[in-house]
Amino acid sequence: AGVFELQIHSFGPGPGPGAPRSPCSARLPCRLFFRVCLKPGLSEEAAESPCALGAALSARGPVYTEQPGAPAPDLPLPDGLLQVPFRDAWPGTFSFIIETWREELGDQIGGPAWSLLARVAGRRRLAAGGPWARDIQRAGAWELRFSYRARCEPPAVGTACTRLCRPRSAPSRCGPGLRPCAPLEDECEAPLVCRAGCSPEHGFCEQPGECRCLEGWTGPLCTVPVSTSSCLSPRGPSSATTGCLVPGPGPCDGNPCANGGSCSETPRSFECTCPRGFYGLRCEVSGVTCADGPCFNGGLCVGGADPDSAYICHCPPGFQGSNCEKRVDRCSLQPCRNGGLCLDLGHALRCRCRAGFAGPRCEHDLDDCAGRACANGGTCVEGGGAHRCSCALGFGGRDCRERADPCAARPCAHGGRCYAHFSGLVCACAPGYMGARCEFPVHPDGASALPAAPPGLRPGDPQRYL
């Protein structure tokens, strides 16, 4: 387990001609925030594929108002790091997408409006525990400067966060072949070797020599599938022969959380909720002050100038916990009606409605969609007595059952070519056209029919704003 950390240094006009206009104005003040999406390996999937390694949203930056006619300077940024926790091993190679969003603070009905200002993407190789890596990426006329690193959460160490540190058994040195755990020199690396024969698919271990089973599997080596029908009593001796799931000692038995932390079970292990002043996998790290940066996800740290006085984290919207480490599950309030699926996008709640229903909270009953299903998260749309599916990104066809090419809808106008790049679709315009989707003709005098936004597009510019 560990955390991927992203530090945004600046977002502003890139070098060269054609400085972009400021995204904010006196009439429409705005502020920026960032979203990062991580995928393992050398992903060639389109931008809309899941962020399998995780995603994070920054806090909102300071409100910014541009003076009329002035070029855009570097824009004010949110405080703090973007942190993406990862539960399993760090993959070493990863793809990233960093989006810069603008929150307009004018008099919009229904609260602020969000719009995507720029998106950059790349593929990188990175070892956990290494130094901050610096990067510069350009999107149109904008330039984003940032640093990133991956670090392991104790007791995990190593370039993939797969080796564990354990307290020394002998005071003087570590066992044969085991090194001290930098920077915890009083601990030793522990080779994580599960019990011989432990199923690599259905078993795992947190202590050398053990074999703990994932849900649905049992037996000393986690090779026996569970058959719940043969269970006579909910608790009793484990039976590897019948394959009956009989809970043995749980991961929270004996409370592994130190310093008054409370333990809750997770599918593969346990999670400690730590009291103020303590953090770490088992709440074992103490003496924390605001200087240690204990507040995650853009939380604001107050007090705690010395180790004896407690600090308090004021969490941004969408996060809670003594260290702002937990994302608030706003979907637990079940805001989506008629069986709609709730999606917490960080900056907004979205309801994905069942076939036959529509509306922001799935409150509208569509008669002609009744009993008709759209697959893969598609939504049924009323249309003159015949149902039609509006498919989620990446899917198409009458019932959204076909895997869609992002270029299938021919998004590039006027004969432009669409390419399925790993960072999202890319348009290459035919001669005489320009813009994100090749929608603007280039006039013979060199001027173009480009509107005021998006800024920074030059003739022949590819698709950059998704």
Epitope: P406, C407, R410, R417, Y419, A420, P431
Partner: antibody
Amino acid sequence: QVTLRESGPALVKPTQTLTLTCTFSGFSLSSSYDMGWVRQAPGQGLEWMGTIYTGDYSTDYASWAKGRVTISVDTSKNQFSLKLSSVTAADTAVYYCARHTGYGYFGLWGQGTLVTVSS
Amino acid sequence: DIQLTQSPSFLSASVGDRVTITCQSTESVYGSDWLSWYQQKPGQPPKLLIYQASNLEIGVPSRFSGSGSGTDFTLTINSLEAEDAATYYCQGYYSGYIYAFGGGTKVEIK
């Protein structure tokens, strides 16, 4: 695993038509790419010959190659091919197939196949 | 016809040296930055180093960097290593769906 592999004759006689095939695996032409051919004469630099765009199967060729080069796709066999007519000794080269998925670069290449034109 | 001119065509440098290769195009590349750099060693296909003028391809050491826009581009190897002995090519993509390669720069280790 995403791969490209070129195949075809190692030796062709002058005036004949050279036909090379590129077999791809690990991806489908239902997505939109440029599939291209690039050649390299012994001791010389890389030379773009042409591409076929899988979105509508339109083709583009280098100015020297127009009229001599034809690129086509057989989606049922996961292959695309190059035909080069009226070959001469100057067409002796290693021929590579390559894939472009946006931003103008060939991110995936075959290993190349050497074709010698000689009588 | 579009021409991409690389200079120098040959250079000899020592391990640890900073090496710069330039690439000049007779026309602006598409989007002003659709230019890439490749490394090629004998008997191997070209290997992508840099795309979109300055983006480092995954797995390529950070000593390689690219810059430039429009018609003038540069590949820099910050601290030359023995394994960097190879031929380097720039390649542009142009309006009208046209590709072109530079003539190549052979880098030798002294």
